[in-house]
C-alpha cells in the first residue's frame, strides 16, 4: 500500500547501556479520519481517559505493523522478521535496546472497510542513541518500585536529572492509557496501592530549528511490600519438650516464617547441643511451604533414623535468621511412659 | 545472589527431544514452585510447567503429555525433558523461581527452533 498518505512521527529512545529497559510504539492513529478505526472519544477535561491512543476498533489487535527497510525493499510485516519485537494489542514492544532498532515503523487497520482507511496509517520514524551524557550519572531507572500503602513517585528516566522548573511538558500513559492529569516529569502518588504497577510511558517534545521530535522513555514500576523490620518467627515446635519412643525413627519439623525482603538470604538450620558441645546436624535442604506477597514460610526437618538414650539428653535447637536477626527454638526429648 | 541460568536450547527437527536444564544457585532453600515458561516470537511470555515442593506438577494444555518437569535438588537444577516437539514450540525458554507470591527470580533464558 502507498504509505506517503500515512501521518508521520518522530521519536527518539535513548537507552542507557548500564540497564537492561523496553520501549513502545503506539498506533496512534490520526483523529479527522471519519472510518471507525480512526475515531477517538472526545473528552471533556474532567473525565478520566481509559482509552488507549488508538481506540478506533473493537478489537484493538486489527492493527498490522511494518517495517520500512532502509534500502527501499517492500514492508516488512514485523511479526514476521523481529522476534525481539512483540505487537500487543495496538502496542509495539521492543524487548532490547539497541541502535538496530532504529528505523521507520508503519501501522494501519488490518480491515480496510471505507476508502477513508486507505490513508488511516502513521508511520514512526525511530531513532535509537545510546545515552552519552555522563552529567546526570544518577537518571532515573526504567525499573521503579513503589512501596504499597505509603506516598511515591515515579520518574521520567529521560528527564530525571532537571528540575521541575526546568522541565517541558510531559505526556504520560499508563499501560497504554493517556493520563490526561499528569503534565510534570514526576507523578506523585499519595498512597500506593496494588493498582500502580504497570507500563508507564513518558513523552515529552524536543526541537531545533529544522525539526521536532517525540523523546519517550518506558518505566516498568512494580508495587512492593516493604522490607520488614521484623526477625522471623518459628511457627513450630511451640513445645520444648517432645514424648518419643525410643529405638523408633522421628523427625523433627520446624517451621519458620520471614517478613519480605527485596534481598532474601533466610537461614533456617538444625543444630545439637550436648553439655558443652554443639554442631550443626546435616539435614534435608530447607523448603518453602507457603508464599505470600507478604511472607514466605519455610521448613526443615532433623531425621533420626532410631531415637537413642543419648539424644535423650541432647537439646535440638532450631535457629533461624533473617538479615534483622535470630530466633530459636529449642526441643528436648522424653522417653514417652506406659 | 540468586541466580538461574537454563542450558540446552537447540535446533531440533520436529518430532524430536530436548532436555533443558536450569542451574540455581545462591537459594538457601527450595521455593515454593519452580516454573518453565515461553516467549514465541511476537508472542507473550506463557507459563509451560511448573513444580512444587512436594513434587505435584502442572502443565499448558499444549504441552500436556509432550512435556515433563522434575527437578533434582541434591543438584539445585531444574528440568524440562521436551518430546514430539512441534513447531509452534520454537521459543525462548526461561525458567523461574516463586518468591513471595510471585515469579520473582528469573533465567536470561535458551533458545529453542524447532524445524526441518
Known amino acids: 500500500f502507498n504509505i506517503s498518505g500515512c501521518s508521520t512521527k518522530k521519536l527518539l529512545w535513548t537507552y542507557s547501556t548500564r540497564s537492561e529497559e523496553e520501549f513502545v510504539l503506539f498506533c496512534d492513529l490520526p483523529e479527522p479520519q471519519k472510518s471507525h478505526f480512526c475515531h477517538r472519544n472526545r473528552l471533556s477535561p474532567k473525565q478520566v481517559p481509559e482509552h488507549l491512543p488508538f481506540m478506533g476498533s473493537n478489537d484493538l489487535s486489527d492493527v498490522q505493523w511494518y517495517q520500512q527497510p532502509s534500502n527501499g525493499d517492500p514492508l516488512e510485516d514485523i511479526r514476521k522478521s523481529y522476534p525481539h519485537i512483540i505487537q500487543d494489542k495496538c502496542t509495539l514492544h521492543f524487548l532490547t535496546p539497541g541502535v538496530n532498532n532504529s528505523g521507520s515503523y508503519i501501522c494501519r487497520p488490518k480491515m480496510i472497510k471505507s476508502p477513508y482507511d486507505v490513508a488511516c496509517c502513521v508511520k514512526m520514524i525511530l531513532e535509537v542513541k545510546p545515552q552519552t551524557n555522563a552529567s546526570c550519572e544518577y537518571s532515573a531507572s526504567h525499573k521503579q518500585d513503589l512501596l504499597l500503602g505509603s506516598t511515591g513517585s515515579i520518574s521520567c528516566p529521560s528527564l530525571s536529572c532537571q528540575s521541575d522548573a526546568q522541565s517541558p511538558a510531559v505526556t504520560w500513559y499508563k499501560n497504554g492509557k493517556l493520563l490526561s492529569v499528569e503534565r510534570s516529569n514526576r507523578i506523585v502518588v499519595d498512597e500506593v496501592y496494588d493498582y500502580h504497577q504497570g507500563t508507564y510511558v513518558c513523552d515529552y517534545t524536543q526541537s531545533d530549528t529544522v525539526s521536532s521530535w517525540t523523546v519517550r522513555a518506558v518505566v516498568q514500576v512494580r508495587t512492593i511490600v516493604g522490607d520488614t523490620k521484623l526477625k522471623p518467627d518459628i511457627l513450630d515446635p511451640v513445645e520444648d519438650t517432645l514424648e518419643v519412643e525410643l529405638g523408633k525413627p522421628l523427625t523433627i519439623s520446624c517451621k519458620a516464617r520471614f517478613g519480605f525482603e527485596r534481598v532474601f538470604n533466610p537461614v533456617i538450620k538444625w543444630y545439637i547441643k550436648d553439655s558443652d558441645l554443639e554442631w550443626e546436624v546435616s539435614v534435608p535442604e530447607a523448603k518453602s511451604i507457603k508464599s505470600t506477597l507478604k511472607d514466605e514460610i519455610i521448613e526443615r526437618n532433623i531425621i533420626l533414623e532410631k531415637v537413642t538414650q543419648r539424644d535423650l539428653r541432647r537439646k535440638f535447637v532450631c535457629f533461624v535468621q533473617n538479615s534483622i536477626g535470630n530466633t530459636t527454638q529449642s526441643v528436648q526429648l522424653k522417653e514417652k511412659r506406659g | 545472589e540468586v541466580q538461574l541460568v537454563e542450558s540446552g536450547g537447540g535446533l531440533v527437527q520436529p518430532g524430536g527431544s530436548l532436555r533443558l536444564s536450569c542451574a540455581a544457585s545462591g537459594f538457601t532453600y527450595i521455593p515454593a514452585y519452580m516454573g518453565w515458561f515461553r516467549q514465541a516470537p511476537g508472542k507473550e511470555r506463557e507459563r509451560v510447567a511448573s513444580?512444587?515442593?512436594?513434587?505435584?506438577?502442572t502443565y499448558a494444555d499444549s504441552v500436556e503429555g509432550r512435556f515433563t518437569i522434575s527437578q533434582d535438588n541434591a543438584k539445585n537444577t531444574l528440568y524440562l525433558q521436551m518430546n514430539s516437539l512441534r513447531p509452534e514450540d520454537t521459543a525462548v525458554y526461561y525458567c523461574?523461581?516463586?518468591?513471595?507470591?510471585?515469579?520473582?527470580?528469573w533465567g536470561q533464558g535458551t533458545l529453542v527452533t524447532v524445524s526441518s
Open positions: 523461574a523461581a516463586y518468591q513471595f507470591g510471585a515469579f520473582r527470580v
Open positions: 513444580i512444587k515442593t512436594d513434587a505435584s506438577t
